[in-house]
């Protein structure tokens, strides 16, 4: 079956927006007014994953780009990256596990847990203009909660 996808933007719990920082990295910073046009638009695809009552498997691609957030080991540490894919084959229902995040949603707050590395989450720093990364702690200094805004 063809995969179902929605376009959206994400802001962290501090209301920082996500923007491109070079060709293969995202960073989080506060944007206002016209600068909001810089924020990346994601294509959130609803993909196959493990059955769970409160976790929805998704893939996060960048709209109109053949780039997907993926989780890989780098120097023995789970790491978030933007990975280039063949647009003829993506998105697809059965995404490779490194592309899959378990969306956990409570009261319109979203967390994205790596399916490849359980208990590792898409995270941002408290500081401005720092890279978006994969973090191994919730409820600490780093921010793992996001809000989502739909985009046409």
């Amino acid at each position: 079956a063809p995969v179902r996808s929605l376009h959206c933007t994400l802001r962290d719990a501090q209301l920082k927006s996500l923007v491109m920082s070079g060709p293969y990295e995202l960073k989080a910073l506060h944007l206002q007014g016209q600068d909001l046009e810089q924020q990346v638009v994601f294509s959130m695809s609803f993909v196959q994953g493990e059955e769970s009552n409160d976790k929805i498997p998704v893939a996060l691609g960048l709209k109109a780009k053949n780039l997907y957030l993926s989780c890989v080991l780098k120097d023995d540490k789970p790491t978030l990256q933007l990975e280039s894919v063949d647009p003829k084959n993506y998105p697809k229902k059965k995404m490779e596990k490194r592309f899959v995040f378990n969306k956990i949603e409570i009261n319109n707050k979203l967390e994205f847990e790596s399916a490849q590395f359980p208990n590792w989450y898409i995270s941002t720093s408290q500081a401005e203009s720092m890279p978006v990364f994969l973090g191994g702690t919730r409820g600490g200094q780093d921010i793992t909660d996001f809000t989502m805004q739909f985009v046409s």
Epitope: A1, P2, R4, L6, H7, C8, F46, Q48, E51, I56, V58, K93, K103, E105, N108, F150, V151, S152
Partner: antibody
Framework: QVQLVQSGAEVKKPGASVKVSCKVS????????IEWVRQAPGKGLEWIGE????????NYNEKFKGKATITADTSTDTAYMELSSLRSEDTAVYYC?????????????WGQGTLVTVSS | DIQMTQSPSSLSASVGDRVTITCKAS??????LSWFQQKPGKAPKSLIY???RLVDGVPSRFSGSASGTDYTLTISSLQPEDFATYYC?????????FGQGTKLEIK
């Protein structure tokens, strides 16, 4: 609590149009797909299409393209379905229902239905 | 389009009976399968979604299961209020499609 309240029954002549409304309350309108389903007298259920008010995305059953037009007004938390060029076979009860944007929860809530009768 | 073949089309049973209704999908639907109950003149009522998850407020005598592309609704001990028509729905692929319905009648 969640409620979907549909507009009242309609009697239309062949060739006319009708617009059915579905007013929702009790949840964040923008985050749920509104589904439209029809049921002809004594028959089963048939999916017409859906709209996500948060971004205006619409998906139609090919069978109803050109027959049904689905819209939503986020200022009034109301979805609409207009049926054009009505024929006697469009006589049915039309239901609205909801499903969360990530498709996980199924068609959980339903409106009470709107009977559209097409008769000369 | 995905075909949902529902069986039986009608079923007579008594209060207290265990009843099963089956829907066979013509292809994989990734567990996007719901069950509904409908009484005459009323809107459908959602019972189960994603194969086996019970909607809030639905009695635990209702359960759902899957084996391959076969999906089953089971009512463990029929109550008088359970006599109605039941429909399955696949919502994995457009157009979403319902089974033809199973009318559950009192024996």
């Amino acid at each position: 609590q969640v409620q979907l309240v549909q507009s009242g029954a309609e009697v239309k002549k062949p060739g006319a149009s009708v617009k059915v409304s579905c007013k929702v309350s009790g949840y964040t309108f923008s985050r749920y797909w509104i589904e439209w389903v029809r049921q002809a007298p004594g028959k089963g259920l048939e999916w017409i299409g859906e709209i996500l008010p948060g971004n205006g995305n619409i998906n139609y059953n090919e069978k109803f393209k050109g027959k049904a037009t689905i819209t939503a007004d986020t200022s009034t938390d109301t979805a609409y379905m207009e049926l054009s060029s009505l024929r006697s076979e469009d006589t049915a009860v039309y239901y609205c229902s909801t499903i969360y944007y990530d498709y996980d929860q199924g068609f959980t809530y339903w409106g009470q239905g709107t009977l559209v009768t097409v008769s000369s | 389009d995905i075909q949902m073949t529902q069986s039986p089309s009608s079923l007579s049973a008594s209060v207290g009976d265990r009843v099963t209704i089956t829907c066979k999908a013509s292809q994989d639907i990734d567990r996007y399968l719901s069950w509904f109950q409908q009484k005459p003149g009323k809107a459908p009522k959602s019972l189960i979604y994603r194969v086996k998850r019970l909607v809030d407020g639905v009695p635990s005598r209702f359960s759902g299961s899957a084996s391959g592309t076969d999906y089953t609704l089971t009512i463990s001990s029929l109550q008088p209020e359970d006599f109605a028509t039941y429909y399955c729905l696949q919502y994995d692929e457009f157009p979403y499609t319902f089974g033809q319905g199973t009318k559950l009648e009192i024996k």
